[in-house]
């Protein structure tokens, strides 16, 4: 089931997933003067078995003059910030993702593609929260938000993350942080079930990450 | 010229139902998604539903959920929103708005949305 509502914002922070759930779907953007050929697909759709999961349909785009014919331009530095959304985020491939089983690795950048991605995310999935560039983490606890269900809503835990202005970078994931004090967590968890398979992994996953993935634009 | 124009908003009590409509004209709504957002006094504009036509994403803000529901008729080229249990916090001018892309849902995601019509007040009392 999709997720109702996006990850939490943050000030002066970004979020990113490591790997996304079987049935996360990311819209097919493109950027500006191109779009989406008209028999293209709108969406990929992270699907699998218990083996292998990967991304169905492509995501193809052409020039907004010439119609269906696709145009191979490199984006120019200044054509790489245009709108800005919260649940878009940069198409980076980490370098040393690890395989999850029922998880896609970060789809590759197709042509002519958005500079931000738009997902829609299924219950279960985690991201992770970063500082921007010019500000330091002061954590409460766990920098990442989980989809859960819970009574037949979905929600997403709040992130326990500060973002200050003190002009260093954050080193994420890696950075010493407080267990959560029972205050910190204003969501009541206690009088619904909700299951947690592959959090954990993912939390031992997120441990060996590098901050490379993150990117800094968000300002 | 693309036009959307709102209809069927009012005034209702508390517990009591709606259902707005937003006629299209200079685009086709099938091959657009279509959503609505709305817009309190004094607040920012907020997501609360959205649809593509290949009905293949349907997505609501979470404080609506269940209670209303996004439809479209695309021959008719006209989207709807049926409102349903409306509370006092319902209160808001509702847009509907359409894009070429897939859904984009969200706290912020009425950017990437094209086009816009110009609202239609739903007031609900307690």
């Known amino acids: 089931e999709l997720c109702d509502d996006d990850p939490p914002e943050i000030p002066h922070a970004t979020f990113k997933a490591m790997a996304y759930k079987e049935g996360t779907m990311l819209n097919c953007e493109c950027k500006r003067g191109f779009r989406r050929i008209k028999s293209g697909s709108l969406y990929m759709l992270c699907t699998g078995n218990s083996s292998h999961s990967s991304w169905d349909n492509q995501c193809q785009c052409t020039s907004s003059a010439t119609r269906n014919t696709t145009k191979q331009v490199t984006p120019q530095p200044e054509e790489q910030k245009e709108r800005k959304t919260t649940e878009m985020q940069s198409p980076m491939q980490p370098v040393d993702q690890a395989s999850l089983p029922g998880h896609c690795r970060e789809p590759p950048p197709w042509e002519n593609e958005a500079t931000e991605r738009i997902y829609h995310f299924v219950v279960g999935q985690m991201v992770y929260y970063q500082c921007v560039q010019g500000y330091r983490a002061l954590h409460r606890g766990p920098a990442e938000s989980v989809c859960k269900m819970t009574h037949g809503k979905t929600r997403w835990t709040q992130p326990q993350l500060i973002c200050t202005g003190e002009m260093e970078t954050s080193q994420f994931p890696g950075e010493e942080k407080p267990q959560a004090s029972p205050e910190g967590r204003p969501e009541s968890e206690t009088s619904c079930l909700v299951t947690t398979t592959d959090f954990q992994i993912q939390t031992e996953m997120a441990a060996t990450m590098e901050t490379s993935i993150f990117t800094t634009e968000y300002q | 010229q693309v036009q959307l124009v709102e209809s069927g908003g009012g005034l209702v009590q508390a517990g009591g139902s709606l259902r707005l409509s937003c006629a299209a004209s200079g685009i086709t709504f099938n091959d657009h998604t279509m959503a609505w957002f709305r817009q309190a006094p004094g607040k920012e504009r907020e997501f609360v539903a959205a649809?593509?036509?290949?009905?293949?994403?349907?997505r609501y803000a979470s404080s609506v959920k269940g209670r209303f529901t996004i439809s479209r008729d695309n021959a008719g080229n006209t989207g709807f929103l049926q409102m349903n249990s409306l509370r006092p916090e319902d209160t808001a001018v509702y847009y509907c708005?359409?894009?070429?892309?897939?859904?984009?849902?969200?706290?912020?995601?009425?950017?990437?949305?094209?086009?816009w019509g110009q609202g239609t007040q739903v007031t609900v009392s307690s």
């Open positions: 708005a359409a894009r070429e892309g897939g859904v984009v849902a969200g706290v912020r995601s009425g950017a990437p949305y094209d086009y």
């Open positions: 649809r593509d036509w290949s009905d293949i994403i349907t």
